[in-house]
């Protein structure tokens, strides 16, 4: 008897379900009465489900497996498991008997991502060029182990004094620790990549020391270290400063904005004169500023597609730079509800409710609840769509049973300005009615 | 435009040296490190090391340690490389290139056109 | 050092055959990056990062792998893609370049 199964590893998130394919070939005239299945841990022959004397002998694996019985005449032996572990990944051995006999294995590869890097600094405060400081890189909770990867800010591998170690925790996903020692220059920015090898995920961080004195010559440029949020078509600061010294002519300086992904030029200052935007016609320096240090770059009605990381360059005898985030985000409109079927209504009908909100950005957050704040998740569908400014319009469908009356409420939230935006409807009455309450 | 411009062909002798050079223009010059990769008739790539042009840091392959100097003029946004001890293998095309991206990906994104040096007696 | 293994060394095809050069790491690497090279020209940025086209490479061609295994691939090849292609890594020092594959169109 010839049984099938995948060639590949079978994948499986921790906490997901899987499937484990295994497949027979039933001769015409089988019955599920003449079926023996056994599936089974490979290595340990730990009995896992079976399926005998026409009936399904249900799971001996922490009562986490299931056949598919509709499709085991078919010919489809396939078992799930329910919220896979760490300690489930191995082979698992589908036996077949009918008259003859057959099985196979198919392998079964657990993945949990890892967290984002976070970062820490030691010693972290009045560091200064020379000093030797211990930077730890920590990603939590992946599997299986991570290959972890440091580099400068322009891309060269730091691979000396580098110590990484992994913890498994009880449920075996690991932790990992990354520590680099480097001895630092005028600044620096040093960036950890950890990788995930079989789900093939990079998590990455980066941080940038600048020592509090710099060699001389060196220019000190200071943006904020909050992204800036801006409104779409309003207008944006991005504050760039540096600390001009005794005597500084603006015919010294060399000023460049410029995206920090692509390189490309925004807006420029040389030879002493504001060389203009080259972004669209919508930036401008502060030039009555310039002088006392302020290179701050004015955007113009502000769009989708200028989020993102802006890097203003200064040039005097020696050179600086840092780059600032820009936040796009718009509010999204007061929910419409609209209610199908919306005539008629009696308790124990089925309606389709949908909340419609438009033009916002980032995405949003929707919610919906009832008329007493229990919150409504089942049979909820949301859709966003963006529309050629790059703006979301969102629409989310509930649908419900009515009972004798009820209000639903949906809520939409801008997860960057942390607004929100709500509409109910209440259906009551007997005949019902609908009536729209907005608050 | 970003351009990397390298310096015309050399014939050198054996025991001499040679200085490449490499004008950048269209960006700025000390945000990226500029590398030297080189290419013998009819053989592969072959990395010689880097300079990052801000902080003037260089790092060389083991096999050019010692006889290869990589140097960076901000003023005039150029890069040299200087090959000493000079023989008939150094025959090559020697190419700068700009190493782009960002954290924590990167790429030669811009080459020079290549200059050929052949050291023959 | 990190070795750059490429297979094949070289291929002959004909146009529209679907090309794939293997690059193999002595070591894992966070990465991979494409050079293609024309005869007498400077070589060419095609895929960085593993799988992403570089700006202007036409959509046949895609990259692949992770770990010590990278893949690039061409779909539907083209009379123009007659160059040798190299695979380049810097996870670890010295920066190193696979020996190269030439590809020759029938």
């Known amino acids: 008897l010839e049984v099938q199964v995948p060639e590949d590893p079978v994948v499986a998130l921790v906490g997901t379900d899987a499937t484990l394919c295994c497949s027979f070939s039933p001769e015409p005239g089988f019955s599920l009465a003449q079926l023996n299945l056994i599936w089974q841990l490979t290595d340990t022959k730990q009995l896992v489900h079976s399926f005998a004397e026409g009936q399904d002998q249900g799971s001996a694996y922490a009562n986490r497996t299931a056949l598919f019985p509709d499709l085991l005449a078919q010919g489809n032996a396939s078992l799930r498991l329910q919220r896979v572990r760490v300690a489930d990944e191995g082979s698992f051995t589908c036996f077949v008997s009918i008259r003859d006999f057959g099985s196979a294995a198919v392998s079964l590869q657990v993945a949990a991502p890892y967290s984002k890097p976070s970062m820490t600094l030691e010693p972290n405060k009045d560091l200064r060029p020379g000093d030797t400081v211990t930077i730890t890189c920590s990603s939590y909770q992946g599997y299986p182990e991570a290959e972890v990867f440091w580099q400068d800010g322009q891309g060269v591998p730091l691979t000396g004094n580098v110590t990484t170690s992994q913890m498994a925790n009880e449920q075996g996903l690991f932790d990992v620790h990354s520590i680099l020692r480097v001895v630092l220059g005028a600044n620096g920015t040093y960036s950890c990549l950890v990788r995930n090898p079989v789900l093939q995920q990079d998590a990455h961080s980066s941080v940038t020391i600048t020592p509090q004195r710099s060699p001389t010559g060196a220019v000190e440029v200071q943006v904020p270290e909050d992204p800036v949020v801006a409104l779409v078509g309003t207008d944006a600061t991005l504050r760039c400063s540096f600390s001009p010294e005794p005597g500084f002519s603006l015919a010294q300086l060399n000023l460049i904005w410029q995206l920090t992904d692509t390189k490309q030029l925004v807006h420029s200052f040389t030879e002493g004169r504001d060389q203009g935007s080259a972004y669209a016609n919508r930036t401008a320096l502060f030039p009555d500023l310039l002088a006392q240090g302020n290179a701050s770059l004015r955007l113009q009605r502000v769009r989708v597609a200028d989020e993102g990381s802006f890097t203003c360059f200064v040039s005097i005898r020696d050179f600086g730079s840092a780059a600032v985030s820009l936040q796009v985000a718009a509010p999204y409109s007061k929910p419409s509800m609209t209610l199908e079927p919306n005539k008629d209504l009696r308790p124990g009908d089925t309606v389709t409710i949908t909340c419609s909100s438009y033009r916002g950005y980032p995405e949003a957050e929707v919610f919906w609840q009832d008329g007493q704040g229990v919150p409504l998740t089942g049979n909820v569908t949301t859709s966003q769509m963006a529309n050629e400014q790059g703006l979301f319009d969102v629409h989310s469908v509930l649908r419900v049973v009515l009972g004798a009356n009820g209000t639903y409420s949906c809520l939409v939230r801008n997860p960057v300005l942390q607004q929100d935006a709500h509409g109910s409807v209440t259906i009551t009455g007997q005949p019902m009615t609908h009536h729209h309450h907005h608050h | 435009e970003v351009q990397l411009v390298q310096s015309g062909a050399e014939v050198k002798k054996p025991g001499s040296s040679v200085k490449v050079s490499c004008k950048a223009s269209?960006?700025?010059?000390?945000?990226?490190?500029i590398h030297w990769v080189r290419q013998a008739p009819g053989q592969g790539l072959e990395w010689m090391g880097y300079i990052n042009p801000n902080s003037r840091n260089t790092d060389y392959a083991q096999k050019f340690q010692g006889r290869v100097t990589l140097t960076a003029d901000k003023s005039t946004s150029t890069a040299y490389m200087e090959l000493s001890s000079l023989r008939s293998e150094d025959t090559a095309v020697y190419y700068c290139?700009?190493?782009?991206?960002?954290?924590?990906?990167?790429?030669?994104?811009?080459w020079g056109q290549g200059t050929t040096v052949t050291v023959s007696s | 050092e990190i070795v750059l293994t490429q297979s094949p060394d070289f291929q002959s095809v004909t146009p529209k055959e679907k090309v794939t050069i293997t690059c193999r790491a002595s070591s894992s690497v966070s990465y991979m990056n494409w050079y293609q090279q024309k005869p007498d020209q400077s070589p060419k940025l095609l895929i960085k990062a593993t799988s992403n086209l570089a700006s202007g490479v036409p959509s046949r061609f895609s990259g692949s792998g992770s770990g010590t295994d990278f893949t690039l691939t061409i779909n539907s090849l083209e009379a123009e893609d007659a160059a040798t292609y190299y695979c380049q890594q810097w996870s670890s020092n010295p920066l190193t370049f696979g020996q190269g594959t030439k590809l020759e169109i029938k």
């Open positions: 269209g960006y700025s010059f000390t945000s990226y490190t």
């Open positions: 290139a700009r190493y782009s991206g960002s954290t924590p990906y990167w790429y030669f994104d811009v």
